[in-house]
């Protein structure tokens, strides 16, 4: 808290300008009118205030707006945003995408701070859903944003927003998140033709079920091994050697390099060695000839 003292004669600030950088903390408190500060917030960013001086300016705004700042002030906070706590931000009602962009710009190049996370949370909740423009903005600043959301939060993403997602935005997503995003992507891209569809859907395939992988295998898609390795193990296991060969096309020889990694390892264990040998890759670990394969999954389902 800054002690209340009278403003020295002739020091009363008529506008927010560079002369204020020479004011002591107590002078700023006494001589800068909070309402003036609120209307001229856009000037603060251009003035090299110290961190201590910014603390005083924040204190003045807090006193003026104890229930939370209006958006007209928030939009022009600039570096003062870095002084805000998540508790401060929870009082705000941010509805403009321009305001969001302005504040994200201040934090650009840094990890997502608790302040930014709270700001985004307030903004998205205020909008009711993650629309395309918001998603575009958030992933531009934080490529990993989408994967930081829970499956429940992702369920509010409309399929139309999926068009804004770039492959790198999904790099850190886990299978549970892709399970939610894949059906939305499938819906979003359903009217595209075969090769274009595959290019778009590829990043989401970690959530694809077996039947969709079987369908893709009929379309000459030539899936690369990096994508194949991200597929759900339970979706890959039922695929036949012929289907995997069609799915991967010329990339099928890459199975050898990944034969000890999941899902390739588990898939190999489910195939007949005879069938694996037809690939000519030297894959080992399949079911030997003459062995009977019992599918116990049906039995488990019935019991």
């Amino acid at each position: 808290e800054v002690e209340k003292t009278a403003c020295p004669s002739g020091k009363k600030a008529r506008e927010i300008d560079e002369s204020l950088i020479f004011y002591k903390k107590w002078e700023l408190e006494a001589c800068v009118d909070a309402a003036l500060l609120a209307t001229q917030m856009d000037r603060v960013n251009a003035i090299p205030f110290t961190y201590e001086q910014l603390d005083v300016l924040k204190h003045k705004l807090d006193e003026l707006y104890p229930q939370g700042y209006p958006e007209s002030v928030i939009q022009h906070l600039g570096y003062l945003f870095l002084k805000m706590s998540p508790e401060d931000i929870r009082k705000w009602n941010v509805t403009s995408l321009e305001t969001l962009k302005a504040l994200l710009e201040v934090n650009k190049g840094h990890e997502m701070s608790p302040q930014v996370a709270t700001l985004i949370d307030r903004f998205v909740k205020g909008r009711g859903q993650l629309d395309k423009d918001t998603l575009d903005t958030l992933t531009a600043f934080y490529p990993g944003y989408l994967c930081s959301l829970s499956p429940e939060e992702l369920s509010s993403v409309p399929p139309s927003s999926i068009w804004a997602v770039r492959p790198q935005d999904l790099d850190t997503c886990d299978p549970r998140q892709l399970d939610v995003l894949y059906p939305k992507a499938r819906l979003a891209f359903q009217n595209m033709n075969g090769s274009e569809y595959f290019v778009k859907i590829q990043s989401f395939l970690g959530g694809a079920p077996t039947e969709d992988l079987k369908a893709l295998s009929q379309q000459n898609v030539s899936m690369d091994l990096a994508t194949f390795m991200k597929l759900r193990t339970d979706a890959v296991l039922p695929l036949t050697v012929a289907e995997v060969q069609k799915l991967l096309g010329p990339h099928v020889e890459g199975l050898k390099a990944e034969e000890r990694h999941r899902p390739v390892r588990d898939w190999i264990l489910r195939q007949r060695q005879d069938d694996l040998d037809t690939l000519g890759l030297g894959l080992q670990g399949g079911i030997p000839n003459g062995y009977l394969v019992l599918d116990l999954s049906m039995q488990e389902a019935l019991s």
Partner: antibody, heavy 119, light 108 residues
């Protein structure tokens, strides 16, 4: 420019552990496995294992099983190799090497990290 | 595991001469799964050839590779001063991946 930058040299006592980092840049981190290869002084190359940064799946050379742990941090595009229960014969230069998923050759190597184990 | 034996251990040649390096596997290696690396003192290895005969990016055409089964060869048609180094063959046909002991190509 594709780069693999490794952490600095380490001197450890027998029985201790060492953790070497390898930070990747200039390419899509999850499209390549990261392998670790070591080279004892005046000796040849020895493959230790690999990690798939996309899934976190690891494969270790049986020789190091139980002593080596490879991990990744996708948020920083960094992989780590920790070797425990160090002995003098673990004194070597440890390299991380990038391997495109689906291939078995290493097209980019880190600069190497010298680990010296001495009492 | 597959043991790769490289010969000779050291090859003493002059610039401009042809170098032939051998790599012999203890059991058959699928040719797609064999590669060669070059290493200079104090430096990291560098990929030269993959899949037995494919030149890696930026590697001059004087380097070539051949072979199948258990016998593989790296040839440098005409040695340049920068080619004097240690060369390693490497297989990933069988687990665990292994490297040969290396052939040192030195200036005569």
């Amino acid at each position: 420019e594709v780069q693999l930058v490794q952490s600095g040299a380490e001197v450890k006592k027998p029985g201790a552990s060492v953790k070497v980092s390898c930070k990747a840049s200039g390419y899509t981190f999850t499209d390549y496995n990261m392998d670790w290869v070591r080279q004892a002084p005046g000796q040849g190359l020895e493959w230790m294992g690999d990690i798939n940064p996309s899934t976190g799946g690891t494969i270790y050379n049986q020789k190091f099983q139980g002593r080596v742990t490879m991990t990744e941090d996708k948020s920083t595009s960094t992989v780590y190799m920790e070797l425990s229960s160090l002995r003098s014969e673990d004194t070597a230069v440890y390299y991380c090497a990038r391997r495109r998923i689906g291939t078995g050759y290493f097209d980019v190597w880190g600069q190497g990290t010298t680990v010296t184990v001495s009492s | 595991e597959i043991v790769l034996t490289q010969s000779p251990a050291t090859l003493s040649l002059s610039p401009g001469e042809r170098a032939t390096l051998s790599c012999s596997a203890s059991s058959s290696v699928i040719s797609s799964y064999l590669s060669w690396y070059q290493q200079k003192p104090g430096s990291s290895p560098r990929l030269l050839i993959y899949r037995t005969s494919n030149l890696a990016s930026g590697i001059p055409a004087r380097f070539s590779g051949s072979g199948s089964g258990t016998d593989y060869t790296l040839t440098i048609s005409s040695l340049e001063p920068e080619d004097f180094a240690v060369y390693y063959c490497h297989q990933w046909s069988s687990f665990p991946y292994t490297f040969g002991g290396g052939t040192k190509v030195e200036i005569k």
